[in-house]
């Protein structure tokens, strides 16, 4: 069956190997014909013909491993219902870095887990990030096939210290915004509590001055400024945070007594109602939704029901007198 | 260590009643919000009701409200589910749960039959 | 009420392997802060749930790392690196982005 005339050259689609002249005569309803499995991978149930709604599971060869849905459905027009499926190796290949930069350990693969530094020679450091983590068949973070070594400055500056700060001798400074930001960083949407306005910032910039300052500068979100939801609550948890009892460090964030940093991204999660801990004396009386009656909620319980822009009016700090 | 132990189910004819009981221990009861969680026989779980810290808020799927009533002692350190008017569709097994910053659902007890059959 | 849709139903097999399941949501379970929460449990051959995954790709306390969970918006997939023979179970996905919350209809995992 070719939904085009067979007076030329057979097609060959760009994903398959195999040329429409090449596939068995079969009817559209009575079944599909064997499904081209993907590089390194075989079909564990095979066989020529396929009935309509059999599924055909995908298996990789030893040293690699299905990624994706690996499942395939035969259709009734005969074709396949099939999802991105790939197999992709259990281990690590060494990766291709330029010249300047030195690979340790050094070795053709690693397995899950084993990470590798990148470094460079004397007075130069990795420009981006030095310590690679083998995840699969590929490295976290990805490997830049660009990356390459820059006049040691800010990482020298920085060494074992925390964000916005730099080495100086045996002990951790403040960055200078102005001299250790020149290089480039990803933007922030950043609250000023001082001028009590909202602004774009650097990141490089937005720590140094945060290490500063700590008290001034409150992160709102990853990304410009733009006005909607993301911005009105940023502000919100940061007018709510001056009583916060809680303050994690996350990131670029700071997790208060509603949140909880997350490991995998790094950033603040709002809890839900019910995960918030009964204590500490931050209460406040509101009133909920269209309800008239005052009820006494702690401030964790408060973050999480404006995070979830439920409805709610905070009438005064402190349990409600009724 | 959270030890949270149901009450023993049991079989009840439609339109019946019955109360279940959670006693909990390894944590301060009345510092958490508490909640029930069933499966039916052979069936995913569903969420059922939620109670706050004092017995003052609960809620409730939409399936069970009128009927079930979440409740709480506190000084018992034991949570209730008062279930009437009893379908053949409430049959199934009832777990107690406490959330954590984690989840909502991070500690379950180890589940109690209910069977709704004439 | 939201729908989690749980693929494949029942997962057959060898230790060793890799696995995947896909939990797909008939709406999206980002909310208007950047927040989504989808869980993972396993439940054991007559025991109670258990956690192993919170906040999309957050491994439970105690959760041992051959377990990871990924996507956004409405597909999400919780992979066992290495499956092991005391992985068998019932594998939920549960999100708490709208009320109720809901769970998907489980995939069982067998050995072979």
């Known amino acids: 069956f070719s939904i085009m005339e067979n007076n030329g050259q057979p097609c060959i689609n760009d994903d398959e190997e195999m040329k429409e002249v090449d596939l068995p005569e079969i009817e559209a309803d009575s079944g599909c014909p064997q499904p081209v499995p993907p590089e390194n991978g075989f079909i564990r149930n095979e066989k020529q013909l396929y009935l309509v709604g059999e599924d055909v599971e995908i298996s990789c060869l030893t040293g690699f491993e299905t990624v994706g849905y690996q499942y395939f459905r035969c259709l009734p027009d005969g074709t396949w219902r099939q999802g991105d499926v790939e197999c992709q190796r259990t281990e690590c290949i060494k990766p291709v870095v330029q010249e300047v930069l030195t690979i340790t350990p050094f070795q053709r693969l690693y397995r899950i887990g084993e990470s590798i530094e990148l470094t460079c020679p004397k007075g130069f450091v990795v420009a981006g990030p030095s310590r690679y983590t083998c995840q699969g068949n590929s490295w976290t973070p990805p490997i830049s096939n660009s990356l390459t070594c820059e006049k040691d400055t800010l990482t020298k500056l920085k060494g074992h210290c925390q964000l916005g700060q730099k080495q100086s001798g045996s002990e951790c400074i403040c960055m200078s915004p102005e001299e250790d930001c020149s290089h480039h960083s990803e933007d922030l949407c950043v609250f000023d509590t001082d001028s009590n306005d909202y602004f774009t910032s650097p990141a490089c910039k937005f720590l140094a001055e945060k290490c500063l300052n700590n008290q001034q500068l409150h992160f709102l979100h990853i990304g410009s400024c733009q006005d909607g939801r993301q911005l009105e609550w940023g502000l919100e948890r940061t007018r709510l945070s001056s009583n916060s009892t809680k303050k994690e460090s996350c990131g670029y964030d700071t997790c208060y007594d509603w949140e909880k940093c997350s490991a995998s991204t790094s950033k603040c999660v709002c809890l839900l109602p019910p995960q918030c801990f009964k204590g500490g004396n931050q209460l406040y009386c509101v009133k909920m939704g269209s309800s008239t009656s005052e009820k006494t909620l702690n401030i964790c319980e408060v973050g999480t029901i404006r995070c979830a822009n439920r409805k709610m009016e905070i009438l005064h700090p402190g349990k409600c007198l009724a | 260590e959270v030890q949270l132990v149901e009450s023993d189910g049991g079989l009840v004819q439609p339109g019946g009643s019955l109360r279940l009981s959670c006693v909990a221990s390894?944590?301060?009861?009345?510092?958490?919000?508490m909640a029930w969680v069933r499966q039916a026989p052979g069936k995913g779980l569903e969420w059922v009701a939620t109670?706050?810290?004092?017995?003052?808020?609960?809620y409730y799927r939409e399936s069970v409200k009128g009927r079930f009533t979440i409740s709480r002692d506190n000084a018992k350190r034991t949570l209730y589910l008062q279930m009437d008017s009893l379908r053949a569709e409430d049959t199934a097994v009832y777990y107690c749960?406490?959330?954590?910053?984690?989840?909502?659902?991070?500690?379950w007890g180890q589940g109690t039959l209910v069977t709704v059959s004439s | 009420d939201i729908v989690l849709t749980q693929t494949p139903l029942t997962l057959s097999v060898t230790p060793g392997q890799s696995v995947s399941i896909s939990c797909r949501s008939s709406?999206?379970?980002?909310?208007?802060?950047?927040?989504?929460?989808l869980y993972w449990y396993l439940q054991k051959p007559g025991q109670s749930p258990q956690l192993l995954i919170y906040?999309?790709?957050d491994l439970g306390s105690g959760v041992p790392n051959r377990f990871s969970g990924s996507g956004s918006g409405t597909d999400f997939t919780l992979k066992i690196s290495r499956v092991e023979a005391e992985d068998v179970g019932v594998y939920y996905c549960?999100?708490?982005?709208?009320?109720?919350?809901?769970f998907g209809a489980g995939t069982r995992l067998e050995i072979k």
């Open positions: 549960m999100q708490a982005s709208h009320a109720p919350y809901t």
């Open positions: 109670i706050n810290y004092d017995g003052s808020s609960t």
């Open positions: 709406q999206s379970l980002l909310n208007d802060v950047g927040n989504t929460y």
């Open positions: 906040l999309v790709s």
């Open positions: 749960a406490r959330p954590s910053t984690e989840a909502l659902f991070a500690y």
């Open positions: 390894g944590f301060t009861f009345s510092d958490y919000y």
